[in-house]
């Protein structure tokens, strides 16, 4: 599964949080940023998470208008030059300082569960998904035959009204 | 080629009930959101409902919500729109739609042509 | 919900003319929008995603942009084959399209 074009067809500043309406926030601790998922107190600032979209050409047979077989892939940045990161050897998910071109692991497909409800699968790991593992996130293997819709990989996207990022 | 093909419209009695399909070929079905929507006489596009790829969600349009209601089989890449309880104000060409991306609920990629709905005594 | 209103609801213009249709959304969509040609007797036909991306065999004389409640709709210069209603459409909240402009030649 390729990415079609090197630019973004856009982007999104939102603030991530789970479908528990726990929210997805990022801390810089000994020179390195660490992922927690936890419940604000009221009127607290939620972080902010900069959601590059890029189409995709799934791999396929099927003929078609040139729409079929595309995705849409995600990159996510809460701060400037670092990026989520798939470890799928460690079933983690991390935040790395990267240079464009961004390493497969940084890619993400988004899933629509919910009309305004998102998952993250892999780009790397068909199948494993962004999701929340004792209040850390977490890669999460989905059988194919569940429902998708299994609420520890649901996010929701806030709108924020900054247009600034970092 | 891309091909979608909506039956099962015509005149109906308001109260009445009637079911739409929606045969998909060229694409892999079970991949894409797919969506009605419905044009009055003369007026514009009104979104309807939508289902999510494994069907597992549904949504509608407030004015149809109880009365109509949106399913997919994957297997036969169908998917159904079966209206109950109609009224007048459901007269108009209703289309079927599919996402523009795999997974995604964003932009109706591809339509058909439609099949016209009458609701009238 | 969300309220989607474009102007003008007809627009006359002449072969060459650089036109532009505008669509106003009642909160901020985050550029979720669609634009959609339809010619008289056909379907709807998906002309611009995002806002701003051209589908797939769409001309270049077709554009998009906007940011926030604002968009617009160009075409550089119009073309007979132009001749349709155009209705944009967002996906930031649920689905609402708005209620189209009829483009017209003079």
């Known amino acids: 599964m390729s990415i079609t074009g090197i630019s973004p067809i856009t982007e999104y500043l939102a603030s991530l949080s789970t479908y528990n309406d726990q929210s997805i926030t990022f801390a810089l601790e000994d020179e390195s940023y660490e992922i927690y998922v936890e419940d604000l107190k009221k009127d607290e600032k939620k972080d902010k998470v900069l959601l590059s979209y890029y189409e995709s050409q799934h791999p396929s047979n099927e003929s078609g208008d040139g729409v079929d077989g595309k995705m849409l892939m995600v990159t996510l940045s809460p701060t400037k030059d670092f990026w989520l990161h798939a470890n799928n050897k460690e079933h983690s998910v991390e935040l790395h300082k990267s240079e464009k071109p961004l390493p497969d692991q940084a890619f993400f497909v988004l899933h629509n569960m919910h009309s305004n409800s998102v998952s993250f699968e892999s780009k790397t790991d068909p199948g494993v998904f962004i999701g929340v593992k004792d209040n850390h996130l977490a890669l999460i293997k989905v059988d194919s035959s569940e429902n998708l819709s299994t609420e520890n990989i649901l996010f929701k996207l806030s709108e924020t009204h900054h247009h600034h990022h970092h | 080629e891309v091909q979608l093909v909506e039956t099962g419209g015509g005149l109906v009695q308001p109260g009445r009930s009637l079911k739409l399909s929606c045969v998909a070929s060229g694409f892999t079905f079970s991949n894409y959101w797919m969506y009605w929507i419905r044009q009055a006489p003369g007026m514009g596009l009104e979104w309807v409902s939508s289902i999510n790829n494994d069907g597992g969600n549904t949504y509608y349009l407030d004015s149809v919500k109880g009365r109509f209601t949106i399913s997919r089989n994957n297997a036969e890449n169908t998917v159904y729109l079966q209206m109950n309880s109609l009224r007048s104000e459901d007269t108009a060409t209703y289309y079927c739609?599919?996402?523009?991306?795999?997974?995604?609920?964003?932009?109706?990629?591809?339509w058909g042509q439609g099949t016209l709905v009458t609701v009238s005594s | 919900d969300i309220q989607m209103t474009q102007s003008p609801s007809v627009l006359s213009a002449s072969v060459g003319d650089r036109v532009t249709l505008s669509c106003k959304a009642s909160?901020?969509?985050?550029?979720?929008l669609d634009w959609y040609q339809q010619k008289v007797g056909e379907a709807p036909k998906l002309l611009i995603y995002f806002t701003n991306n051209l589908q797939t065999g769409i001309p270049s004389r077709f554009s998009g942009s906007g940011s926030g409640t604002d968009y617009t709709l160009t075409i550089s210069s119009l073309q007979p084959e132009d001749v349709a209603t155009y209705f944009c459409f967002q996906y930031n909240s649920g689905w609402t399209f708005g209620q189209g402009t009829k483009v017209e030649i003079k």
């Open positions: 739609a599919k996402g523009h991306y795999y997974y995604s609920s964003y932009s109706l990629g591809y």
């Open positions: 909160h901020n969509i985050n550029k979720h």
